[in-house]
Amino acid sequence: QSFQVNPPESEVAVAMGTSLQITCSMSCDEGVARVHWRGLDTSLGSVQTLPGSSILSVRGMLSDTGTPVCVGSCGSRSFQHSVKILVYAFPDQLVVSPEFLVPGQDQVVSCTAHNIWPADPNSLSFALLLGEQRLEGAQALEPEQEEEIQEAEGTPLFRMTQRWRLPSLGTPAPPALHCQVTMQLPKLVLTHRKEIPVLQ
């Protein structure tokens, strides 16, 4: 017997609004395999079952988040494989404030990532960069999380804001700082960056 799931990963990240097919197949030494997907903590969406295989179509909606299980049976043996599906949203929608920095004075800078999911501090991180390095002396304040106002119901996206108290930018002042936001997902790291110019 052979039992296969494609893609084979036990965790899959799917961008909101994009689709993914997960195929579970099995062949038996004798007879025809029975293969089917079952929802554990997720609505299954669209499933196409054929002799010896079953295709789960994930539509990239938040309701797809969960862990479906493929069950394959051959005579007196059964196999199971679960796939943890995480639907995420991480558009390039960073907003920084102020629009530019003034050298020679203390100031607070904020960086907001809009329409984010999951809004989880463990998966989303902020950094204030000078060149490619974190800016030394910047004091990170408590991050804030707020639900976005949605036109459509059922899509609870969030905006996350990180503020830093900056020391006085020395002279000569750097041309710009950058806010960098990173989302860490299973086998996937996404990054967006926004420039904050410094007045010269």
Epitope: S10, Q80, S82
Partner: antibody, heavy 120, light 107 residues
Framework: EVQLLESGGGLVQPGGSLRLSCAAS????????MHWVRQAPGKGLEWVAV????????YYADSVKGRFTISRDNSKNTLYLQMNSLRAEDTAVYYC?????????????WGQGTTVTVSS | DIQMTQSPSSLSASVGDRVTITCQAS??????LNWYQQKPGKAPKLLIY???SLQSGVPSRFSGSGSGTDFTLTISSLQPEDFATYYC?????????FGGGTKVEIK
């Protein structure tokens, strides 16, 4: 409170039969796969059989295949194990246990066990 | 059938020690590996499911890792109530199989 309560164990002669029962309460019995797992005196755990939530699929350990039958009555919230042609090596504490969708996620609720002794 | 090999079969440790138990499957089982704790005269208790997910109500000092064929159960700081026998179990295919167990004793 989620609970599993086994009964039906006892002393039986080699070649004899026993029927174990497991009464479930505190959870939606018909949504869970159910197992029997046994443990011989001083030994480790040995899986015996599983039945799917609706009773349509049943799988057995090679050591009991053809002799033991797992079944369930969802209207009575009860799991059964019919044991025939018993052997001395079937002597063990028998546990019933639950698992979401057969078994992938582990056996998360266990009964206290019922003792089966096969001896002449 | 998938064989599960657990090691060590027993170990002696002190309260506060970090304890690591390993389990090896004879073939790839993805992340379908569960860990149980059993105390004398009691039923087993599920600690970790799907290789690394902590079962509800289990203290966070227990953690699991691994995928494929090699898995680990770690107790970060052993407590008096953790002296017990630990079993791994594969949930990838029937017949389901358990490791031989690891008895954790007081040093």
């Amino acid at each position: 409170e989620v609970q599993l309560l086994e009964s039906g164990g006892g002393l039986v002669q080699p070649g004899g039969s026993l029927r174990l029962s497991c009464a479930a309460s505190g959870f939606t019995f018909s949504s869970y796969g159910m197992h029997w797992v046994r443990q011989a005196p001083g030994k480790g755990l040995e899986w015996v059989a599983v039945i799917s939530d609706d009773g349509s699929d049943k799988y057995y350990a090679d050591s009991v295949k053809g002799r033991f039958t797992i079944s369930r009555d969802n209207s009575k919230n009860t799991l059964y194990l019919q044991m025939n042609s018993l052997r001395a090596e079937d002597t063990a504490v028998y546990y019933c246990t639950t698992s979401k969708y057969y078994y992938y996620y582990g056996m998360d609720v266990w009964g206290q066990g019922t003792t089966v002794t096969v001896s002449s | 059938d998938i064989q599960m090999t657990q090691s060590p079969s027993s170990l002696s440790a002190s309260v506060g020690d970090r304890v690591t138990i390993t389990c090896q499957a004879s073939q790839d089982i993805s992340k379908s590996l569960n860990w149980y704790q059993q105390k004398p005269g009691k039923a087993p208790k599920l600690l970790i499911y799907a290789a690394s997910s902590l079962q509800s109500g289990v203290p966070s000092r227990f953690s699991g890792s691994g995928s494929g064929t090699d898995f680990t159960l770690t107790i970060s700081s052993l407590q008096p109530e953790d002296f017990a026998t630990y079993y791994c179990q594969q949930g990838y295919s029937t017949p389901l199989t358990f490791g031989g167990g690891t008895k954790v004793e007081i040093k």
